[in-house]
């Protein structure tokens, strides 16, 4: 299953399959997730080791048993790959690292006014993988405001150095934020020239294209079909690059197919997995296990659940079958692709779905209406769980926020439905940033069921929580995916990085905002919060957040939206915007429904008809 916990001051011994430099443990974990063999990783921050060569070292590891012995190492961080973790799987990494220079091949230098502008340039440059920016206070005046665009053979820095007044980060192309745009066309009977960066075997050009998309240096590809004239080259997928970023030439060639990486697509990237099943095809590789199962779909599920399994073949040969069950061969290889592909067999083959974003149909559970005051504009895909709950009567207007917690579930505040319990009048917009982008043609979700907490009473602050079941499940994308829920009764975690988001008023007597606003707000203990509300009881089912001096808060229209906190690189839904005394007033924290206290209720209500939980805890 999905294991998200990180181990501080621990290092996994042995099992090394690759090593690289990464700026933090979260990026190391992401590289492990996308590495075909990596199950575990260990990361050495700069502070944890004197050896300059091992600083920022990210060590990817495999283990037949799925675990390795941990040794104590001060400062080290270890953890698991996020394979099998559904919507948490993403190659998108937005963080900017201050005081760090990520080294690589510098291929472009320009003057820019901010690190965000530098990141944008990298994202809009086809070859840029990461960048470094020298701030206005950099010690050498001639380098100040320099934006260096970089790449490397592996897509990760060739070295990382601590350097004052330098900020570094990665391209946001994997976040589907590139302005370049992409070529979706597949070119039949055409071969591209230029430099081969890798060679793998794939059953078709679509798998080849997805592998190219997620390969750090692949910009385009050529695939040789299973009837290509040279037998040894059949099903070969050649991943390619060039100096210019486009093929310098193409040759008409029977039984070849070419195309481009989809990494530069805007708003939508292919999933990093291959769900198609190939009848009459055998995939060869190292045998992991053989099991008897009923049907090829069950074989694929078995492969997906066995974390080391990369691909499978389901044999229908009479000697491989017993009654209704046949042999399911679970296999793996060094690069994650079959070592041999054979056609015209009595088998069916396919890939593990361990890297599919959708995962199973689960949710990740790891007094006055309120809004965002003192916030700033959000950017695309920054808060992909945020939804807008809108009511259409004569006109249509935004009323509340909400959080996507599963394909078919939104969590919000019960008070959003005070006086408006009719599900037909509501429209739920997900994957949006600007309310002005909504037109009559913008797709929206309708409500199948509104589940208000049984102890909620209108105009009271207690039990202000409601679930919305959508009429149809939503697909996950970089801009529309769920937030993890906390563990039940999560009281021990100390959250220090919390944000509230919404389109609500930007001042107490204001109006709904067009661009989704965000504000970083510290949590306040319930004891402190209680002292500031002389008339209302702050229960253990509430959590408070706010600044002593005020100025930043949620406001009218933010109700029902998320209070999320980042812990160990993972965002969790800690609170639901509920109520407060005005907005952003001095010494009056916002009050939020504490999600951890309602986990039993959430899990009970989201049980599907077959009794399978629709959400799961990250822990």
């Amino acid at each position: 299953g999905c294991l998200t916990q990180l181990y501080e001051n621990a290092f996994f011994r042995g099992g090394d399959v690759a090593s690289m430099y990464t700026p933090n443990a979260q990026y190391c974990q992401m590289r492990c997730t996308f590495h075909p063999r990596c199950l575990l990783f260990s990361f050495l921050p700069a502070s944890s080791i004197n050896d300059m060569e091992k600083r920022f070292g990210c060590f990817l590891k495999d283990s037949v048993t799925g675990t390795l012995p941990k040794v104590h190492r001060t400062g080290a961080v270890s953890g698991h790959s996020l394979k099998q973790c559904g919507h948490q799987i993403s190659a998108c990494h937005r963080d900017i690292y201050k005081g760090v220079d990520m080294r690589g091949v510098n291929f472009n230098v320009s003057k820019v006014s901010s690190v965000e502008e530098c990141q944008k340039r990298c994202t809009s440059n086809i070859r840029c993988q990461f960048f470094s920016y020298a701030t206005q206070t950099f010690h050498k005046a001639e380098y100040r405001n320099n934006c260096l665009l970089k790449y490397s053979p592996g897509g990760t820095p060739t070295a990382i150095k601590v350097l004052s007044n330098v900020e570094s980060g990665f391209s946001l192309k994997p976040c589907a934020l590139s302005e370049i745009g992409c070529h979706m066309n597949i070119f039949q009977h055409l071969a591209f020239s230029d430099v081969d960066v890798a060679r793998v075997l794939t059953p078709d050009a679509f798998v080849c294209r997805t592998i190219c998309t997620y390969h750090p240096n692949c910009l385009f590809f050529t695939f040789y079909t299973n009837v290509w004239k040279i037998e040894s080259q059949r099903n070969v997928c050649l991943l390619k690059t060039s100096e210019s970023g486009t093929p310098s030439s193409s040759t008409p060639q029977e039984n070849t197919i070419s195309g481009y990486s989809l990494l530069t697509c805007k708003r939508t990237l292919p999933e990093p997995c291959h769900s198609k099943i190939y009848p009459g095809v055998d995939f060869g590789g190292e045998e992991l296990n053989v099991t008897f199962v009923k049907g090829v779909n069950v074989c694929q599920e078995t492969c997906t659940k066995m974390i080391r399994c990369q691909f499978f073949t389901y044999s229908l040969l009479p000697e491989d079958c017993k009654e209704e069950k046949c042999k399911c061969f679970l296999r793996l290889s060094m690069d994650g692709s079959p070592t041999r592909i054979a056609y015209g067999t009595q088998g069916s083959s396919g890939y593990s779905l361990r890297l599919c974003n959708t995962g199973d149909n689960s949710v990740c559970t790891t007094k006055t209406s309120t809004r965002i005051v003192g916030g700033t504009n959000s950017s695309w895909g920054e808060w992909p769980w945020q939804v807008s709950l809108q009511v259409k009567l004569t006109a249509q207007r935004h009323l509340c926020g909400g959080s996507l917690i599963g394909h078919q579930w939104v969590l919000t505040a019960a008070h959003c439905f005070d006086g408006l319990p009719l599900q037909d009048v509501w429209r739920i917009y997900s994957g949006i940033l600007n309310l002005s982008d909504i037109t009559k043609d913008t797709p929206f979700s309708q409500i199948k069921e509104i589940i208000i907490h049984q102890n909620y009473k209108v105009s009271e602050g207690n039990h202000d929580i409601a679930l919305i079941k959508l009429q149809a499940p939503l697909n996950y994308t970089e801009f529309q995916k769920p937030i993890c829920l906390p563990s039940k009764g999560d009281t021990s975690t100390i959250y220090t990085n919390c944000w509230v988001t919404g389109w609500g008023f930007s001042k107490e007597k204001g109006e709904i905002q067009n661009i989704l606003q965000k504000v970083n707000i510290p949590l306040v203990t319930n004891e402190e919060c209680q002292k500031r509300y002389q008339d209302y009881k702050i229960t253990q089912r509430m959590v408070c957040a706010g600044y002593k001096e005020g100025g930043k808060d949620a406001c009218k229209g933010d109700s029902g939206g998320p209070l999320v906190c980042k812990h160990n690189g993972m965002w969790r839904l800690v609170g639901i915007t509920s109520w407060g005394e005005g907005c952003a007033r001095r010494e009056q924290p916002g009050v939020y429904t504490k999600v951890a206290e309602y986990m039993d209720w959430i899990l009970e209500k989201t049980q599907s008809s077959d009794g399978k939980a629709q959400m799961q805890s990250p822990a």
Partner: antibody, heavy 116, light 106 residues
Framework: EVQLQQSGAELVKPGASVRLSCTAS????????IFWVKQRPKQGLEWIGR????????KYDPKIQGKATLTADTSSNTAYLQLSSLTSEDSAIYYC?????????WGQGTLVSVSA | DIQMTQSPSAMSASVGDRVTITCEAS??????IAWYQQKPGKAPKLLIY???TLQSGVPSRFSGSGSGTEFTLTISNLQPEDFATYYC????????FGQGTKVEIK
């Protein structure tokens, strides 16, 4: 309208016990805290304790030392103050009050007279 | 335990006067002080909380100030209905009242 109705005056003998009630209307006591405050004749106010009727969690003034016991019955929306081993020092008006961080709304008070 | 020392214990004033009552805490109470007014035979009434926040419905002639351990209640234009006893209350650590200040007609 928020109201706290306290029980009537009590005349009790030294060493005896007494139970005072505070019945709420206009709100549910589970949604608030109930506080008790003592005021001796011609003297100031003293906080006795606080109960959270939702879970019966209580806090007392450390000086009370078992003199007072706070309880609540959510079905009747009533809070109680039990005073034991009464002495003349316990003769006072006892107020119940509701609130969050402090006492926002008060009952009318109950006079307890301890006399042989 | 936090002690609250209120002064004066009694004072005489006339309608229209500016009246100041002080409360000193034995420790820093982080501005968690409230002021109550009590009239004979009646329950106390909350006037001000968190040093200076006026409870709704309380006239604006009442104001509170202070920080750390020194706090003040001011009635800027004393009205006939303001003759009463005033109590401070610290609620930073449990609850402690001051001894009270009786404001009488001169």
């Amino acid at each position: 309208e928020v109201q706290l109705q306290q029980s009537g005056a009590e005349l009790v003998k030294p060493g005896a016990s007494v139970r005072l009630s505070c019945t709420a209307s206009g709100f549910n006591i589970k949604d608030t805290y109930i506080f008790w405050v003592k005021q001796r004749p011609k003297q100031g106010l003293e906080w006795i304790g606080r109960i959270d009727p939702e879970n019966d969690n209580t806090k007392y003034d450390p000086k009370i030392q078992g003199k007072a016991t706070l309880t609540a019955d959510t079905s009747s929306n009533t809070a109680y103050l039990q005073l034991s081993s009464l002495t003349s020092e316990d003769s006072a008006i006892y107020y119940c009050a509701k609130g969050g961080g402090l006492f926002a709304y008060w009952g009318q008070g109950t006079l307890v007279s301890v006399s042989a | 335990d936090i002690q609250m020392t209120q002064s004066p214990s009694a004072m005489s004033a006339s309608v229209g006067d500016r009246v100041t009552i002080t409360c000193e805490a034995s420790h820093d109470i982080n501005n968690y002080i409230a002021w109550y007014q009590q009239k004979p035979g009646k329950a106390p009434k909350l006037l001000i909380y968190y040093t200076s926040t006026l409870q709704s419905g309380v006239p604006s002639r009442f104001s509170g100030s202070g920080s750390g351990t020194e706090f003040t209640l001011t009635i800027s234009n004393l009205q006939p209905e303001d003759f009463a006893t005033y109590y401070c209350l610290q609620y930073d650590n449990l609850f402690t009242f001051g001894q009270g200040t009786k404001v009488e007609i001169k």
